[in-house]
């Protein structure tokens, strides 16, 4: 007997062919001999089966000697042996309907687990193989689990169900809810405006939740909440903000924060958390602020950085168009009795300048000018 695999919710066409290429009488029945449909002349007639409103045929094919049974919106319980009676002969087709669903929402937070559950008819013994968007293969029986979802797991998962050497393919769209970057670092000169951006790695029609930015300043003994906000249908509204610093927040996505001035006392690390409605757990993004200050006090030219810098970063002081006078893997460098001219303080990583501050040193009888 012919085996046909179907997907839950899909439409399937079971074929039945007569040797005569013309419209003749046919009937489709189920294994309990209950009539599903047939014809009376050119009219389609239906029997008392549970498929009544979901069964159909195509009149245009009858003249070709084809008498299909089309079942719409397939259910697992439609799995059965269907019998086509035409020209005093019987054709049997075994239909097996499978369903594959994500047992939770298909929108999952980064780090959460995905479980795919296969619904299958009694007596079947299918195998399932799924391929993630990043090409990772997982195999299983009735359930497949993937722990610690990563951002690259967002996209279409393609799962193949194998039964009786036949296969049916499912596509499940998974959205991993996360920020585009786990961590970011902003380098600023003292006094400059600071922009923090927290772009999301996903798009959904309606996004509702609440968030908070906690800040651990390098100079402070404990962290403090800088801002709390609500998100309703992608609209941002500030709930509470500290007086120092007085952050400003954009009203639209992506989440955007502005610090009016970069000051040494603000240098440090922040953690923005976003709790989404109807989701357990939170999204996190770390943000770091490094602040640079170049000063001249009497005969001492000093350059300092505050904030989370890597030990491999180089801090240098150099007179414009000259070799660096001082260059160290430290957070402060200085030059005694600096020559007059435009001095540059540079924070660099393997030769790439991350931050630069210029200070003009005047001849000794003058006071320094900061551009």
């Amino acid at each position: 007997k012919k085996v046909v695999l179907g997907k839950k919710g899909d439409t399937v066409e079971l074929t039945c062919t007569a040797s005569q290429k013309k419209s003749i009488q046919f009937h489709w029945k189920n294994s309990n001999q209950i009539k599903i449909l047939g014809n009376q002349g050119s009219f389609l007639t239906k029997g008392p089966s549970k498929l009544n409103d979901r069964a159909d045929s195509r009149r245009s094919l009858w003249d070709q000697g084809n008498f299909p049974l089309i079942i719409k919106n397939l259910k697992i319980e439609d799995s059965d042996t269907y019998i086509c009676e035409v020209e005093d002969q019987k054709e049997e087709v075994q239909l097996l309907v499978f369903g594959l669903t994500a047992n939770s929402d298909t929108h999952l937070l980064q780090g959460q687990s995905l479980t795919l559950t296969l619904e299958s008819p009694p007596g079947s013994s299918p195998s399932v193989q799924c391929r993630s968007p990043r090409g990772k293969n997982i195999q299983g029986g009735k359930t497949l689990s993937v722990s610690q979802l990563e951002l690259q797991d967002s996209g279409t998962w393609t799962c193949t169900v194998l039964q009786n050497q036949k296969k049916v393919e499912f596509k499940i769209d998974i959205v991993v809810l996360a920020f585009q970057k786990a961590s970011s670092i902003v380098y600023k000169k003292e006094g400059e405006q600071v922009e923090f951006s927290f772009p999301l790695a996903f798009t959904v029609e309606k996004l509702t939740g609440s968030g908070e930015l906690w800040w651990q300043a390098e100079r402070a003994s404990s962290s403090k909440s800088w801002i709390t906000f609500d998100l309703k249908n992608k609209e941002v509204s500030v709930k509470r903000v500290t007086q120092d610093p007085k952050l400003q927040m954009g009203k639209k996505l992506p989440l955007h924060l502005t610090l009016p001035q970069a000051l040494p006392q603000y240098a440090g690390s922040g953690n923005l958390t976003l709790a989404l409605e109807a989701k357990t757990g939170k999204l996190h993004q770390e943000v770091n602020l490094v602040v640079m200050r170049a000063t001249q006090l009497q005969k001492n030219l000093t350059c300092e950085v505050w904030g989370p810098t890597s030990p491999k970063l180089m801090l240098s002081l150099k007179l414009e168009n000259k070799e660096a006078k001082v260059s160290k893997r430290e957070k402060a460098v200085w030059v005694l009795n600096p020559e007059a001219g435009m001095w540059q303080c540079l924070l660099s990583d393997s030769g790439q300048v991350l931050l630069e501050s210029n200070i003009k040193v005047l001849p000794t009888w003058s006071t320094p000018v900061q551009p």
Epitope: K7, T11, E13, S42, R59, S60, D63
Partner: antibody, heavy 115, light 107 residues
């Protein structure tokens, strides 16, 4: 809900080949026939032909020698090629899903054949 | 090929009127007939299938009847959005064919 979105070249010269593709979003790709219908400006509807997910085709005898309908189930899309076009092939071309009746329809693509 | 002939080819009516459009097949097509509505610049939309079954979401003022070779589409009380062109289509045999259309215009 099933949605059909079609695309392809809108301006052709006589003797060229018309090529249109229809993307199917949502719903079942199997079990239905995927159809092309055209409508010359200010005129009625003409059935061109159809294909199912396994590649079985039926087409209008009046166009059969020039029509090729193909399907790519992995992309949930089907395509129409009409060779040796003339000005008489100028029409809005629609893709649609069929199970005896046509529903839903693509947005339509105006194809103009002009030298 | 089965020829489908619609009449009238155009009809003028007012909001609230009852309108009937007929469709005749050149041979018996049982009840393998559908009705579509098309507005300018848009794709046709299925209204009625199997001669008399109303598609879900279509207002109940639309109804279809007939069997064999003669069919009718009735709009019981015209609404402003009903002014459009209507087509019948047979699904009895290949090639599928349509009527030439009936344009329903505001009087």
């Amino acid at each position: 809900q099933v949605q059909l979105q079609q695309w392809g070249a809108g301006l052709l010269k006589p003797s060229e080949t018309l090529s249109l593709t229809c993307d199917v979003y949502g719903g079942s790709f199997s079990g239905y026939y995927w159809t092309w219908i055209r409508q010359p400006p200010g005129k009625g509807l003409e059935w061109i032909g159809e294909i199912n997910h396994s590649g079985t085709t039926n087409s209008n005898p009046s166009l059969k020698s020039r029509v090729t309908i193909s399907v790519d189930t992995s992309k949930s899309q089907f395509s129409l090629r009409l060779s040796s076009v003339t000005a008489a092939d100028t029409a809005v071309y629609f893709c649609t899903r069929e199970l005896n009746w046509f529903d839903p329809w693509g947005q339509g693509t105006l194809v103009t054949v002009s030298s | 090929d089965i020829q489908m002939t619609q009449s009238p080819s155009s009809v003028s009516a007012s909001v609230g009127d009852r309108v009937t459009i007929t469709c005749r097949a050149s041979q018996d097509i049982a009840n393998w007939l559908a009705w579509y509505q098309q507005k300018p610049g848009k794709a046709p939309q299925l209204l009625i299938y199997a001669a008399s079954s109303l598609l879900g979401g279509v207002p109940s003022r639309f109804s279809g009847s007939g069997s064999g070779a003669d069919f009718t589409l009735t709009i019981s009380s015209l609404h402003p959005e009903d002014f459009a062109t209507y087509y019948c289509q047979q699904a009895n045999s290949f090639p599928y064919t349509f009527g030439q259309g009936t344009k329903l215009e505001i009087k």
